[in-house]
Amino acid sequence: GIAIPRNSGCPNSEDKNFPRTVMVNLNIHNRNTSTNPKRSSDYYNRSTSPWNLHRNEDPERYPSVIWEAKCRHLGCVKADGNVDYHMNSVPIQQEILVLRREPRHCPNSFRLEKILVSVGCTCVTPIVHHVA
Amino acid sequence: GIAIPRNSGCPNSEDKNFPRTVMVNLNIHNRNTSTNPKRSSDYYNRSTSPWNLHRNEDPERYPSVIWEAKCRHLGCVKADGNVDYHMNSVPIQQEILVLRREPRHCPNSFRLEKILVSVGCTCVTPIVHHVA
């Protein structure tokens, strides 16, 4: 591990290198100071690659509830409202960090976990494979 | 608060109710068992609302590197490669959890933080405000 510059006011840790188990304060600090009115709240309906949001709940995970996007169509919606199958609606995915209770049901012990979530959809030109 | 169902193998916690400070194992478990070759890797170029990825680094944050999307155009790219300004490229944003070193520089003490990141862009029909 790499030693991090230590602040003398830090809690003690046996391993002075990068620790495997750390203390985390769950009082979430929100860095998004103001509510952004331009946030994606209605993009899922107005997009040319619209999506539905599906609720996923797991009480052993922090956060317990995650809303995931699923593209409505294989193609993209044209100005006339019809679907153009020469284009593709695809999910934009992101790896996010969550906390997993470990051991199960423990209120104060977690393991960091990376999961892949679909955040929304975008319209892309398909990759055409030409046969020789 | 509500006490959580306790597993007898849980580490001790002074407060038997919902803890504010918890133990987190930083050995990340990756639930995305297989690397999905269809991941959004090249969507940023093929999308009708293409985006660039900007690196954001903060050594006081875990993860310290986050890649953010910025839409390339105000409008959306048409089949002929020109930009249609009757449509809008907009960022799809998501609130994600990160760990912030607290106190600063501490290797083993963090606070949970929520930040808003742009994951990619999508093409939407604009909201037209009609003047009476």
Epitope: I28, T35, S40, D42, L53, E57, Y62, W67 | I4, F18
Partner: antibody, heavy 121, light 106 residues
Framework: QVQLQQSGAELVRPGTSVTLSCKAS????????IHWIKQTPAQVLEWIGV????????LHNPKFDGKATLTADKSSRTAYMELRSLTSEDSAVYYC??????????????WGQGTSVTVSS | QIVLTQSPAIMSAFPGEKVTMTCSAS?????MCWYQQKPGTSPKRWIC???KLASGVPVRFSGSGSGTSYSLTINSMETEDAATYYC?????????FGGGTKVEIK
């Protein structure tokens, strides 16, 4: 302190629509979902569905598909439920309640005072 | 959908008496919540995740159970406990409530 302030009682005609509101205060609006519950005159409780103010996502009890539309406005910290094609069966008290997305063991921990809807010609 | 059946529908107890009500689910569920409601007021979260008391709930209350069988017990009935208690599951959609057990004081 946490409050879910619901709109006032409604007396409406059959076949019409009504929109109920639920204004949240005293907590971070996007950290919680808003769930809607119907309580019939016989005191039966029914879960109508949920809306997530952060993503705009909604999930309905299939029984209320086409009947209830759930939305939320982050800027005004208000959740809405529109009830359509009202009949006498829709006469009830409707509650909004919040649900913490990060730790689901909290359950529906705060409830609004309820909005009474009476459908009558 | 999962049907929750509460019994008894109505019961009465003397102050100091032990009271037990049950909630039976038509399919196995992971956790049960209980809500208390008094006439003219909104329901209040009472017990969640089967056995965990909400803040402010007296310790004379307890919850237990697993699978398809759950119960709420008042160890020593008090006047203020007279109310209707509803069980609720969130293991599968749609979420459902039991029909309620009305507890009266003798």
């Amino acid at each position: 302190q946490v409050q879910l302030q619901q709109s006032g009682a409604e007396l409406v005609r059959p076949g019409t629509s009504v929109t109920l509101s639920c204004k949240a205060s005293g907590y971070r609006f996007t950290d919680y979902e808003i769930h809607w519950i119907k309580q019939t005159p016989a005191q039966v409780l029914e879960w109508i569905g949920v809306t997530d103010p952060e993503s705009g996502g909604t999930l309905h009890n299939p029984k209320f598909d086409g009947k209830a539309t759930l939305t939320a406005d982050k800027s005004s910290r208000t959740a809405y439920m529109e009830l359509r094609s009202l009949t006498s069966e829709d006469s009830a008290v409707y509650y909004c309640t919040r649900y913490y997305k990060y730790e689901s063991f909290y359950g529906m921990d705060y409830w609004g005072q309820g909005t009474s809807v009476t459908v009558s010609s | 959908q999962i049907v929750l059946t509460q019994s008894p529908a109505i019961m009465s107890a003397f102050p100091g008496e032990k009271v037990t009500m049950t909630c039976s689910a038509s399919s196995s569920i992971s956790y049960m919540c209980w809500y208390q409601q008094k006439p003219g007021t909104s329901p209040k979260r009472w017990i969640c995740d089967t056995s965990k008391l909400a803040s402010g709930v007296p310790v004379r209350f307890s919850g237990s159970g697993s699978g398809t069988s759950y119960s709420l017990t008042i160890n020593s009935m008090e006047t203020e406990d007279a109310a209707t208690y509803y069980c609720q599951q969130r293991s599968s959609y749609p979420w459902t409530f039991g029909g309620g057990t009305k507890v009266e004081i003798k």
